[in-house]
């Protein structure tokens, strides 16, 4: 029961992750103009990844898309980069991770099947909530250095009689969805990791053998115990990993194919 | 065609209040802010201010802080100017103008003050 | 507050004659976002509401006869009739439309001869 909720869990944080990060990427205001030194401009710009807006007195908002790729700076081309890798990744994840909930059954699927589609869904939902935050986070620091280069310069006179302010760009909105929807997607991502753990295939249904031991009888009917009875509440039950029998202490010091989280 | 209808002539005593509607039509009137723009008699024009009709938001030139108080209807597509404690000095024609760079005004409300 | 200084305050001109108008601002009305300049020009006939000539410094308003043309950058700026015309003689204004509040210049008076 818990590794069905820790998996669907997960597959829901990453579904708003990756929502999230088309949204960001999408958005038109990744910098916003800095009002700091004019605060009663009439006309407001901002940037996102495809286009740069202008935003007039009219209340009028004029968008211009970047109709150049050879044109446009290299960070912005590998943030806009990292962001498509980061949705496809999270969208093949997604896709992935539908067929590896344990809550639907599709065909004779194996659990061994299930748990390696969800490990394989949570990697795919962590590099692509990395890619997020790495290519929001590059954004971010570009901002930062241009925001330093053009307070430095920050008045170009004509003669030191009219005073130019130049337009400088701070934070937008999509960089804080951007890295919100990463963090999602990453913890998402590693929701269903351990949620795989979980998943190990369970034994098939052996009719129960009698072990004779001396003094008394003890019937014993092997059968792997269910993730939901939790870690360490029943370390005396073994559990089939792979084929061989180990105690759950020794599941967890030695990995197994599904023990990356 | 946009088109904007300003309510008619005003004729107001000194301390009064006066309230000029324009009525808004042939567009979205949330897509674009309502100016107010005053034009006394022989002279240049001054900017008032503006009102947002899609989230309520308002900027005014601070000359007219206190002054003017622009408010809007947005069922009616009717933006509103009310002008408070009128004076000879504010006897002028008053204008609303929208679209962009003012690409529409309308034919303007004169307000007289007089005793 | 941006002021917007128009010269000269009055121009006698004869119909068919070229005429020039300027206008200067105490900032630069240029904006690096899109590399316009927010000056726009107003023609006013007595007992009209001004009329949008042109914008971002030197774009016309659809409607609006070829013999108008706006010019300049940053502060200095001119509005030119190429041939002036009987229906032309009016009130010009410039006005600031980058920083709040909107400023207008005090206009140019057109009068005929």
């Known amino acids: 029961m818990a590794v069905t909720a820790c998996q669907g869990l997960g597959f829901v944080v990453s579904l708003i992750g990756i929502a999230g990060i088309i949204a960001a990427t999408c958005m038109d205001q990744w910098s916003t103009q800095d009002l700091y030194n004019n605060p009663v401009t009439a006309v407001f710009n901002y940037q996102g990844l495809w286009r740069s807006c202008v935003r007039e007195s009219s209340g009028f908002t004029e968008c211009r898309g970047y109709f150049t790729l050879l044109g446009l700076p290299a960070m912005l081309q590998a943030v806009r980069a990292l962001m498509i890798v980061g949705i496809v990744l999270g969208a093949i994840g997604l896709l992935v991770s539908i067929f590896a909930l344990k809550c639907i059954r599709i065909g004779s699927m194996e659990d061994s099947a299930k748990a390696n589609m969800t490990l394989t869904s949570g990697i795919m939902f962590i590099v692509s909530g990395l890619c997020a935050i790495a290519g929001v986070s590059v954004f971010a620091n570009m901002l930062v250095t241009n925001f330093w280069m053009s307070t430095a310069n920050m008045y170009t006179g004509m003669g030191g009689m009219v005073q130019t302010v130049q337009t400088r760009y701070t934070f937008g909105a999509a960089l804080f969805v951007g890295w919100v929807a990463g963090g999602l997607t990453l913890i998402g991502g590693v929701m269903m990791c351990i949620a795989c753990r979980g998943l190990a295939p369970e034994e098939t249904n052996y009719k129960a053998v009698s072990y004779h031991a001396s003094g008394h009888s003890v019937a014993y009917k092997p059968g792997g115990f269910k993730a939901s009875t939790g870690f360490g509440s029943n370390t005396k039950n073994k559990k089939i990993y792979d084929g061989g029998a180990r105690t759950e202490d020794e599941v967890q010091s030695y990995p197994s194919k599904h023990d990356y989280v | 065609e946009i088109q904007l209808q300003q309510s008619g002539p005003e004729l107001m005593k000194p301390g009064a209040s006066v309230k000029i509607s324009c009525k808004a039509s042939?567009?979205?009137?949330?897509?674009?802010?309502m100016h107010w723009v005053k034009q006394s008699h022989g002279k240049s024009l001054e900017w008032i201010g503006y009102?947002?009709?899609?989230?309520?938001?308002?900027n005014y030139n601070q000359k007219f802080k206190g002054k003017a108080t622009l408010t809007a209807d947005k069922s009616s597509s009717t933006a509103y100017m009310h002008l408070s404690s009128l004076t000879s000095e504010d006897s002028a024609v008053y204008y609303c103008?929208?679209?962009?760079?003012?690409?529409?005004w309308g034919a303007g409300t004169t307000v007289t003050v007089s005793s | 507050d941006i002021v917007m200084t128009q010269s000269p305050s009055s121009l006698t001109v004869t119909a068919g004659e070229k005429v020039t108008m300027s206008c200067k601002s105490s900032?630069?009305?240029?904006?690096?976002?899109?590399?316009?300049?927010?000056l726009t020009w107003y023609q006013q006939k007595p007992g009209q509401p001004p009329k949008l000539l042109i914008y971002?410094?030197?774009t016309r308003e659809s409607g609006v006869p070829d013999r108008f043309t706006g010019s300049g950058s940053g502060t200095d700026f001119t509005l030119t009739i190429s041939s002036v015309q009987a229906e032309d003689l009016a009130v010009y204004y410039c006005?600031?439309?980058?920083?709040?509040?909107?400023?207008f210049g005090a206009g140019t008076k057109l009068e005929l001869k």
């Open positions: 103008a929208c679209y962009r760079f003012f690409a529409v």
């Open positions: 042939g567009y979205s009137f949330t897509s674009y802010y």
């Open positions: 009102f947002d009709p899609y989230n309520g938001g308002t």
């Open positions: 900032q630069s009305l240029l904006n690096s976002g899109n590399q316009k300049n927010y």
């Open positions: 971002w410094a030197s």
């Open positions: 006005q600031n439309d980058y920083s709040y509040p909107l400023t």
